[in-house]
Structures are given as structure tokens and as C-alpha cells.
């Protein structure tokens, strides 16, 4: 009933709880002297389904047959309407539509840990939409039985609160769950099991790792387990990997040696346990242990390259460059690099430890035969040294690679191609392709990049440290024993017209001609490799087309003579620069009047 129903009653037949698809009869009856005051014929009883009118009747009672009610609860309210007054609520009823419970399926019981309690889960089947009570029953040896009830609306789990012990691990227990509601009942199939079947060990805890003599090859994993555990699964992986290595061990007694770990690598370790070879289930995985393996001495050898620069008649500057070892080769934190410089004939040697850099520059005499050795050191030792003899890399003209070209290859890549040298191509032991940003001053601080290419290759794709709209000086070296030949070219991955023209800084007169000097365009405004400069001139105040002179771009050139100007005529001069993409805007304008005689 919805309220006190003082004025009348609502009755529901056959029941307030009905099977889906059934019909109910709802009767609303007024109690004596509870109708409209003046004339009972004007009593109008109205039946509402929720907030919608579904039937009415003039008189003291209303009968309504209702069909097609949906699953769940439907509220019916009966009201009285009298002339010239608000409707009065008489009474109401809720009707519950549902189904009998289906047979519970997949009943499964588990005891978490040797000290845990038995809990069971099952699948209820489709929702009954009615209050349904579940009773779980467990029977064991010696006619022992336990029972637990559950009155939650969605009940699919119950914990008996009892602990099975390993005294008789082969004893059988049987569980059954029964669902009951107003429309029927149904029981699951019985589930029979032993202690070993249902006890799921707690995950291992207190996991530790030890490296004997700080060596990765002598590594033992330790953990603690419940007493009856027979089997363990170990899984481990480098922290940056998604794939696990898996190991199964029997009777490990809380320790296992791992033999295939990589040095100086952070690993994640987890362990799981099981009580019996083929009965029961694995525990959850333990919490992860994260640990870094110890360092080992580096393997591999450094990739070393060098550059020579003439200083004066007796001295030369040597700049050595090397690449970091890969993580798998470094096998630890590289603390320093050891560079040894030796004059081969005199035997003089100089050793230096370099930290924080992968380059070293020194000045040596131009005479003598020099060699260098470079190795990388971590806390455990050093890599094998890379030894190279210092030679004139471009001395052997016959070893110079031919027809070197550099073409843009997609975003921030340059494809360098060449032809083998004229001299016996089979003499080439390797090619080295070197590139660095082009700086007009020939700045030695500009980072050097290089890659090595096998002797049968005639192309290389360079992509490391390549930026758009920057011009690179690219050299291809052919190395053969203690000889080398080289060819160079300029290249860029992406270009457009320069943003500005050269700035004329001086015009001087020399024997009837003029010499124009200019400042280079700043590198960030060149927008790629410059191909030409153009010098334009025309008579001041003239509307005629300017004359021009086009000069091929050379890195070091910043002046050029012009000898076709008339004396005592004032000219306006300016310059532009060109890349393969087009011409820059004008640089500054300068006026000049040649004083001397015409040629």
C-alpha cells in the first residue's frame, strides 16, 4: 500500500508479484461515506499508472484489467474526482513483474591463501527483477555442512567465513547454490573439490635480488612464500620493454638464480605461486620488484673520426670526434674517455681523460707520424681502444670519389651519391661521409657528423642533425690503408629564396675599375645553399634596366671587381643572392662615381 488508504482500498489479483506476460485485476473501492458529498453518481474514480490515467468509473468502485506490464515495478494509484474540486488520492499499489530465477551457472569456490576463508562465485543468469534470495551450501567429510544466505539485489558472491586446512588435502567438499523468489526456485549443479583444488596461494612477498661480487652473471632472486607452495613462476623484463621472460621452477624454496640478465639495465621482477603440479590455481602476481643490474666493462669500440687544420709552417691542429657507445655496448655509465696521442717514430705518448665531451682538440707538429687511440671507461673497465693513424685524408687525388651529388630526400634527409675513384676501386676499404653546417668563417666549433659506408656502396642517406633551410658542407672520403682521397659538395634538405641580399660594405677604385666588398648573409637568412651572387648597377636617376654580373658562390669570397663603369658617372649598385629556390630581395644600395679615365 502506498499510503494509509483511509478513504478506500486498492486490491490486486492474483498477486502483487506476477510473472512477465501475466494479467492482473486492479480494484479500487471507496469506503462508506468517502465519496463526493452531494451525489454519489458524480463519484469519478480514476486509475493512474504512474502519472497517466488509464481507466475511470463513475460510482463507488472501479475494476480494471491490466496487461502488458514491463519487467520491474509499476505503480498504480486510484484517485477520486468530484465536481469543482481537486482530485483526492484514495489508495495505491505497486505491482512487481519478474521471472523465476534461472539455474545459477559456473559455481566456483576459492580460498585465498592457506589461512583464508572459502568464498564462492556464480553466474546468476538473467535478472529476475524481483527480490531473490540466494543460499550457498557447503558439505564436507563427516556430514559437516555450512550454509550462508545473501539478500543483495545482485548476489553472485558469498564468503562462508570458514578456513579449509591441509590436514586431509584429498578430502572432498561439495558446494551448491539455490536461488529463490516469489515465482520459483532453481539450484546450481553441485561443485565438488578438494583443499588443493581451491586454495589459491597468496602472492609471494619480500622479494629481493642479490648480485654476488657485483656481477650480473651471479644474480639470485629471493622471496617468501606460504609453506605448502610447490611451484613458482618468475617473470622479468627490462623496464622499457613490454615482453616478459618467463621461468617455471619447482621446489625453489624461495630462491632462484637468473643467468641471462643484461648489465646496467633496470628490470621488473614478479613471482607467482602454486600448491600442486596440476591441481589448483596460480596465485596473483606479486608486487613488482624493480632493480638495476650492475655495470660490466664496455664492449664494442668507439667510432672515431678526425679533422686536421693547418696552423702554420710547423704546426697543425687535430680535432678528434667520437660517437657514444650504444647502451648495450656501454654496459654502464661512461665516466670518461681516454685519448692517447703517440708519435710513432719517436715513441712520445700523451694520454688524457676527457669527461663530458665526445671531442678533443690539440696542436701537434706537422712533422712525424701520429696515431691516436680512444677508449670509453665505466666503473668496471674500458672498451677496446679504437686506433687510427693521422693522415692527410684528402692527399691521394686518385682516391677522390667522383661525381659527388647531394639531393634532398624527404623531410630533413639528404641523399649523397658518388662514383668510385679512378684508381682501382677495389682498393677502397671504406667510405666516410662527413657533414657539418656551412659557416663562412670555417668555424671549427661547428659540430661534425659522419657515417661510415661499406666499400661497395655508392650512396648514403644522411639524416642525423639535418635541419631545414641550412646549408651543409658534405665530404665523401675514400680510405685505403694509410691513404685517403676526398671530394666535397654543398647540400640542403629544404631550401627557399634567401631572406636578404648581401650588404655592400665598401667600393674602392683600382686602375679604372672598381672592387666591391660585401658582408656575408647571416646563416639563418641564407635559407639553404647559395649558388650565386648578383651585382646590379645602373646610372643614378635613370629608368633603364640595370646591368648585372653573376658570380658563382664561394664560401670565402666577399669581393669582386667590375670594370665596365664609365668615369664621372654616378652609379647606384646593390646585390642579391640566389639559392636553387630563387633570388633574395635587394641588399643595401650604394652610390659610386668612378674618378679615373675610361678603359
Amino acid at each position: 500500500k502506498i499510503d494509509a488508504c483511509k478513504r478506500g482500498d486498492v486490491t490486486v489479483k492474483p498477486s502483487h508479484v506476477i510473472l512477465l506476460g501475466s494479467t492482473v485485476n486492479i480494484t479500487c473501492s471507496l469506503k462508506p461515506r468517502q465519496g463526493c458529498f452531494h451525489y454519489s453518481r458524480r463519484n469519478k474514480l480514476i486509475l493512474y499508472k504512474f502519472d497517466r490515467r488509464i481507466n475511470f468509473h463513475h460510482g463507488h468502485s472501479l475494476n480494471s484489467q491490466v496487461t502488458g506490464l514491463p519487467l520491474g515495478t509499476t505503480l498504480f494509484v486510484c484517485k477520486l474526482a468530484c465536481i469543482n474540486s481537486d482530485e483526492i488520492q484514495i489508495c495505491g499499489a505497486e505491482i512487481f513483474v519478474g521471472v523465476a530465477p534461472e539455474q545459477p551457472q559456473n559455481l566456483s569456490c576459492i580460498q585465498k591463501g592457506e589461512q583464508g576463508t572459502v568464498a564462492c562465485t556464480w553466474e546468476r543468469g538473467r535478472d529476475t527483477h524481483l527480490y531473490t534470495e540466494y543460499t550457498l551450501q557447503l558439505s564436507g567429510p563427516k556430514n559437516l555442512t555450512w550454509q550462508k544466505q545473501c539478500k543483495d539485489i545482485y548476489c553472485d558472491y558469498l564468503d562462508f567465513g570458514i578456513n579449509l586446512t591441509p590436514e586431509s588435502p584429498e578430502s572432498n567438499f561439495t558446494a551448491k547454490v539455490t536461488a529463490v523468489n516469489s515465482l520459483g526456485s532453481s539450484s546450481s549443479l553441485p561443485s565438488t573439490f578438494t583443499f588443493l583444488d581451491i586454495v589459491r596461494p597468496l602472492p609471494p612477498w619480500d622479494i629481493r635480488i642479490k648480485f654476488q661480487k657485483a656481477s650480473v652473471s651471479r644474480c639470485t632472486l629471493y622471496w617468501r612464500d606460504e609453506g605448502l607452495v610447490l611451484l613458482n613462476r618468475l617473470r622479468y623484463r627490462p623496464s622499457n620493454s613490454r615482453l616478459w621472460n618467463m621461468v617455471n621452477v619447482t621446489k625453489a624454496k624461495g630462491r632462484h638464480d637468473l643467468l641471462d640478465l643484461k648489465p646496467f639495465t633496470e628490470y621488473e621482477f614478479q613471482i607467482s605461486s602454486k600448491l600442486h603440479l596440476y591441481k589448483g590455481s596460480w596465485s596473483d602476481w606479486s608486487e613488482s620488484l624493480r632493480a638495476q643490474t650492475p655495470e660490466e666493462e664496455p664492449t664494442g669500440m668507439l667510432d672515431v673520426w678526425y679533422m686536421k687544420r693547418h696552423i702554420d709552417y710547423s704546426r697543425q691542429q687535430i680535432s678528434l670526434f667520437w660517437k657514444n657507445l650504444s647502451v648495450s655496448e656501454a654496459r654502464g655509465k661512461i665516466l670518461h674517455y681516454q685519448v692517447t696521442l703517440q708519435e710513432l717514430t719517436g715513441g712520445k705518448a700523451m694520454t688524457q681523460n676527457i669527461t663530458g665531451h665526445t671531442s678533443w682538440t690539440t696542436v701537434i707538429p706537422r712533422t712525424g707520424n701520429w696515431a691516436v687511440a680512444v677508449s670509453a671507461a665505466n666503473s668496471k673497465g674500458s672498451s677496446l681502444p679504437t686506433r687510427i693513424n693521422i693522415m692527410n685524408l684528402c692527399e691521394a687525388g686518385l682516391l677522390a670519389p667522383r661525381q659527388v651529388s647531394a639531393n634532398s630526400e624527404g623531410m630533413d634527409n639528404i641523399l649523397v651519391t658518388w662514383q668510385p675513384p679512378r684508381k682501382d676501386p677495389s682498393a677502397v676499404q671504406e667510405y666516410v661521409v662527413e657533414w657539418r653546417e656551412l659557416h663562412p668563417g670555417g668555424d671549427t666549433q661547428v659540430p661534425l657528423n659522419w657515417l661510415r659506408s661499406r666499400p661497395y656502396n655508392v650512396s648514403a642517406l644522411i639524416s642525423e642533425n639535418i635541419k631545414s633551410y641550412i646549408c651543409y658542407e658534405i665530404r665523401v672520403y675514400a680510405l685505403s690503408g694509410d691513404q685517403g682521397g676526398c671530394s666535397s659538395i654543398l647540400g640542403n634538405s629544404k631550401h627557399k629564396a634567401p631572406l636578404s641580399g648581401p650588404h655592400i660594405n665598401a667600393i674602392t677604385e683600382e686602375k679604372g675599375s672598381i672592387l666591391i666588398s660585401w658582408n656575408s648573409i647571416p646563416v639563418q637568412e641564407q635559407m639553404g645553399c647559395l649558388l650565386h651572387y648578383r651585382i646590379y648597377w645602373k646610372e643614378r636617376d635613370s629608368n633603364s634596366q640595370p646591368q648585372l654580373c653573376e658570380i658563382p658562390y664561394r664560401v670565402s669570397q666577399n669581393s669582386h671587381p667590375i670594370n665596365s663603369l664609365q668615369p664621372r658617372v654616378t652609379y647606384v649598385l646593390w646585390m642579391t643572392a640566389l639559392t636553387a629556390a630563387g633570388e633574395s630581395s635587394h641588399g643595401n644600395e650604394r652610390e659610386f662615381c668612378l674618378q679615373g679615365k675610361a678603359n
Epitope: 494479467t23 469519478k44 480514476i46 499508472k49 502519472d51 497517466r52 490515467r53 488509464i54 481507466n55 475511470f56 468509473h57 463513475h58 460510482g59 472501479l62 475494476n63 480494471s64 484489467q65 491490466v66 496487461t67 502488458g68
Partner: nanobody
Framework: QVQLQESGGGLVQPGGSLRLTCVAS????????MSWVRQPPGKGREWISA????????DYADSVMGRFTISRDNAKNTVYLQMNSLKSEDTAVYYC????????????????WGQGTQVTVSS
Amino acid sequence: QVQLQESGGGLVQPGGSLRLTCVASGFPFSTHAMSWVRQPPGKGREWISAINSGGDSTDYADSVMGRFTISRDNAKNTVYLQMNSLKSEDTAVYYCAKYEDCSDYDCSSRASWGQGTQVTVSS
């Protein structure tokens, strides 16, 4: 699904009579109260009459009281509206509907209305 088919409309002179018929299908007719509704041209719909599921109680809007009579035949799944003393203001499209979708209390749902039948009262 619920289907309601109205018929019997037409052109009639003021003071004349018409009988509208509504045949229902797709639901248990005898357990549902039914209504007649009309929609004059250019105006909103207006509930005019209802009959309960047993056919023993009826209700009318004041505008048609004494002139219109609603009745039903549960054996034929049919509801009728006898209209007498018709006036020009009775001109409208007439629909039948389940009472739960349209009553004197609430006529907002068009879930189970029929297609309607046109009644025109004109001299």
C-alpha cells in the same frame, strides 16, 4: 503494434448528425479506456470524450455535453462517437486514442492516435 482506424467523417449542414467509428487492433482492447480527440483547423488538439474499459462510464468536454454520445463494442474492438446538433465550430479532424495517451487530464502523447477523419459542418 497499436493501430487505430477512424471513419465516418464528411460534410454536414449545421444541426445535422454523423456517427464516427474507430476500429482498434494490436492491443487488448477490452482492458483499455478510449478517448475521442479533435483538432480544428489552425488550432491545438482538444479532448472531447472518453469511455472506460467496461463501457459503463463516460466523460465529455463541456463543449459537446448533451450533443455527443460515446460508446464501444468490445466484441468488435470498436469505439463510436454519435454527433448530433452539429455546429460550424465542430469542424475539425477527429481522432480516437487510448485514454492513457489522451485524457481530459493530459493529451500530450500521440503514441497511439489514428490517422483521423475530417468532419466539416457548413451550410
